[in-house]
């Protein structure tokens, strides 16, 4: 058993049929010695008396809020949560496996630049009685500070018969140098509590590996006189690290006909302009990627040819 | 047919093209190592991230773009760079910084070159003949060093008398390649920045 936060405790249980469970001793936080009784949740049934209560925790029915009273007055509470271990593996029932970039990916994180700011998100089908708390650090043995905000519900989607909820959190490394070469990864730890079930999820990464620039901005077409050709130009996104001559981007330019059957034409270029032969109903799209370290491509910025 | 081709125009910072070739060569070599040594811990997640130049060179600090010198977090470990004689003219200070930066890059390349050559000598003794260093990568390191045109004492190639542990050597190769790739990215950024300046 360990303390998650004040008056909230996590009991780690090997979860299999007829498991013996864990013996837990609760102590009432009071100077009083006599006349103390214990109850569980809203029940008035007295579970025991005395300053300590010994219980055998085997299942969710044994978890919950234990309260010690004296003469009708509440003295203190202890909330017991269960953390299940099945076949030596901690349960992952609360969050959905996003399977990207690999199986057992519950947390996904992205950074728009090298400032040390990043966003993580996760998915669940659970809509109520759900709380999250997020901690992060750079390295684990001698951790350096990363500050995370509160996790918030950021999107709701319907997936078949189910509703899916996306939660996200923003974190910022306390003292980040954009030009630094990372040798210790960022660690992100999410505590998830659904009713009386506790689970924890972790992710470890280097900022350089989770970079995904915003799409190029101000994508514009300028027709060239006496020609079917147009000059396409775009700019670095505002959120990208500066100076741009140091944190350079490369771009993918794509020309796509109206029908998906028409073959695309595409090139990669380090410039922020290109000349394109614009056919009726075609569209021009541009996306960005760090020029020197191949992490994710941005989403596309697109403009119609007409 | 392949005609001899002139080098990029001289207005271009001469090392930029070499540094781009370096990054390409290191990335290719790392990819090859990860494929060939698929049953070894050779991915970014599996290896220890070591920097053989730590405490010996200060490339990141010495080559920091001027725009980032206002960032306190970037100045933490800066002992040498930007601390110059107060009476120096701005242009002299800039050229001094650039010289410091480029000589630091040169020292990095020299250290990695020695490590890679030593390692290759060991790998050539492996009866499995599983992996060797790409000669193109070694040539590209050499080309960039020549383009940087610094003179410094030659570091003797480390030779060891004991029987090499090929498993350890291959893991060390992965560690070295990952670290060198990260340094090659920094070098490319620096060359791009200097070219634009």
């Amino acid at each position: 058993i360990w303390e998650l936060k004040k008056d909230v405790y996590v009991v780690e249980l090997d979860w299999y049929p007829d498991a013996p469970g864990e013996m837990v001793v609760l102590t009432c936080d009071t100077p009083e010695e006599d006349g103390i009784t214990w109850t569980l949740d809203q029940s008035s049934e007295v579970l025991g008396s005395g300053k300590t209560l010994t219980i055998q925790v085997k299942e969710f029915g044994d978890a919950g809020q234990y309260t010690c009273h004296k003469g009708g007055e509440v003295l203190s509470h202890s909330l017991l949560l269960l953390h299940k271990k099945e076949d030596g593996i901690w349960s992952t029932d609360i969050l959905k496996d996003q399977k990207e970039p690999k199986n057992k990916t519950f947390l996904r994180c992205e950074a728009k630049n090298y400032s040390g700011r990043f966003t993580c998100w996760w998915l669940t089908t659970i809509s109520t009685d759900l709380t999250f708390s997020v901690k992060s650090s750079r390295g684990s043995s001698d951790p350096q500070g990363v500050t995370c905000g509160a996790a918030t519900l950021s999107a709701e989607r319907v997936r078949g018969d189910n509703k899916e909820y996306e939660y996200s959190v923003e974190c910022q490394e306390d003292s980040a140098c954009p030009a630094a070469e990372e040798s210790l990864p960022i660690e992100v730890m999410v505590d998830a509590v659904h009713k009386l079930k506790y689970e924890n999820y972790t992710s470890s990464f280097f900022i350089r590996d989770i970079i995904k620039p915003d799409p190029p901005k101000n994508l514009q077409l300028k027709p060239l006189k006496n020609s079917r050709q147009v000059e396409v130009s775009w700019e670095y996104p505002d959120t990208w690290s500066t100076p741009h001559s140091y944190f350079s981007l490369t771009f993918c330019v794509q020309v796509q006909g109206k029908s998906k059957r028409e073959k695309k034409d595409r090139v990669f270029t380090d410039k922020t302009s290109a000349t394109v032969i614009c056919r009726k109903n075609a569209s021009i799209s541009v996306r960005a990627q760090d020029r020197y370290y191949s992490s994710s491509w941005s989403e596309w910025a697109s403009v119609p040819c007409s | 047919r392949n005609l001899p081709v002139a080098t990029p125009d001289p207005g271009m910072f001469p090392c930029l093209h070499h540094s781009q070739n370096l990054l390409r060569a290191v990335s290719n070599m790392l990819q090859k190592a990860r494929q060939t040594l698929e049953f070894y811990p050779c991915t970014s997640e599996e290896i220890d991230h070591e920097d053989i130049t730590k405490d010996k060179t200060s490339t990141v600090e010495a080559c920091l773009p001027l725009e980032l010198t206002k960032n306190e977090s970037c100045l933490n470990s800066r002992e040498t760079s930007f601390i110059t004689n107060g009476s120096c003219l701005a242009s002299r200070k800039t050229s001094f910084m650039m010289a410091l930066c480029l000589s630091s890059i040169y020292e990095d390349l020299k250290m990695y070159q020695v490590e890679f050559k030593t390692m290759n000598a060991k790998l050539l003794m492996d009866p499995k003949r599983q992996i060797f260093l790409d000669q193109n990568m070694l040539a590209v390191i050499d080309e960039l060093m020549q383009a940087l045109n610094f003179n410094s004492e030659t570091v003797p190639q480390k030779s060891s008398l004991e029987e090499p542990d090929f498993y350890k050597t291959k893991i060390k190769l992965c560690i070295l390649l990952h670290a060198f790739r990260i340094r090659a990215v920094t070098i490319d950024r620096v060359m791009s920045y200097l070219n634009a300046s």
Epitope: V253, R266, I277 | -
Partner: nanobody
Framework: EVQLVESGGGLVQAGGSLRLSCAAS???????MGWFRQAPGKEREFVAV????????DYGDSVKGRFTMSRDNAKKAVYLQMNSLKPEDTAVYYC??????????????????WGQGTQVTVSS
């Protein structure tokens, strides 16, 4: 190995036009193609580059708006239409096959195969 042969060069007055052609001995449809030029005593200079399907192009600053590159993959050929020619356009023009299928580059060493070149002279 692809052989390239340029043609269409010659002597032209300033303000005039020329159309250069580059014929390839094998398929060029899966690579970018470029035109470069070299004036006596000067570095080889990037002129234009074209994507595999010919819809995306890039031009050197000195020729933008005056030159137009195109390709015909079925004919295994690329072309360079040069209008409003200036004396400073005088050079040997080379066509080249890019080493990659889809990365634009202005750097000659990023191109694999080169033609022998065709001389363009613009008189004032």
């Amino acid at each position: 190995e692809v052989q390239l042969v340029e043609s269409g060069g010659g002597l032209v007055q300033a303000g005039g036009s020329l159309r250069l052609s580059c014929a390839a001995s094998g398929s060029i449809s899966s690579n970018i193609m470029g035109w470069f030029r070299q004036a006596p005593g000067k570095e080889r200079e990037f002129v234009a580059v074209i994507s595999r399907r010919g819809l995306i192009l890039d031009y050197g600053d000195s020729v933008k708006g005056r030159f137009t590159m195109s390709r015909d993959n079925a004919k295994k050929a690329v072309y360079l239409q040069m209008n409003s020619l200036k004396p400073e356009d005088t050079a040997v023009y080379y066509c080249a096959v890019g080493k990659t299928t889809d990365r634009f580059s202005e750097i000659p060493s990023d191109y694999d195969y080169w033609g022998q070149g065709t001389q363009v002279t613009v008189s004032s």
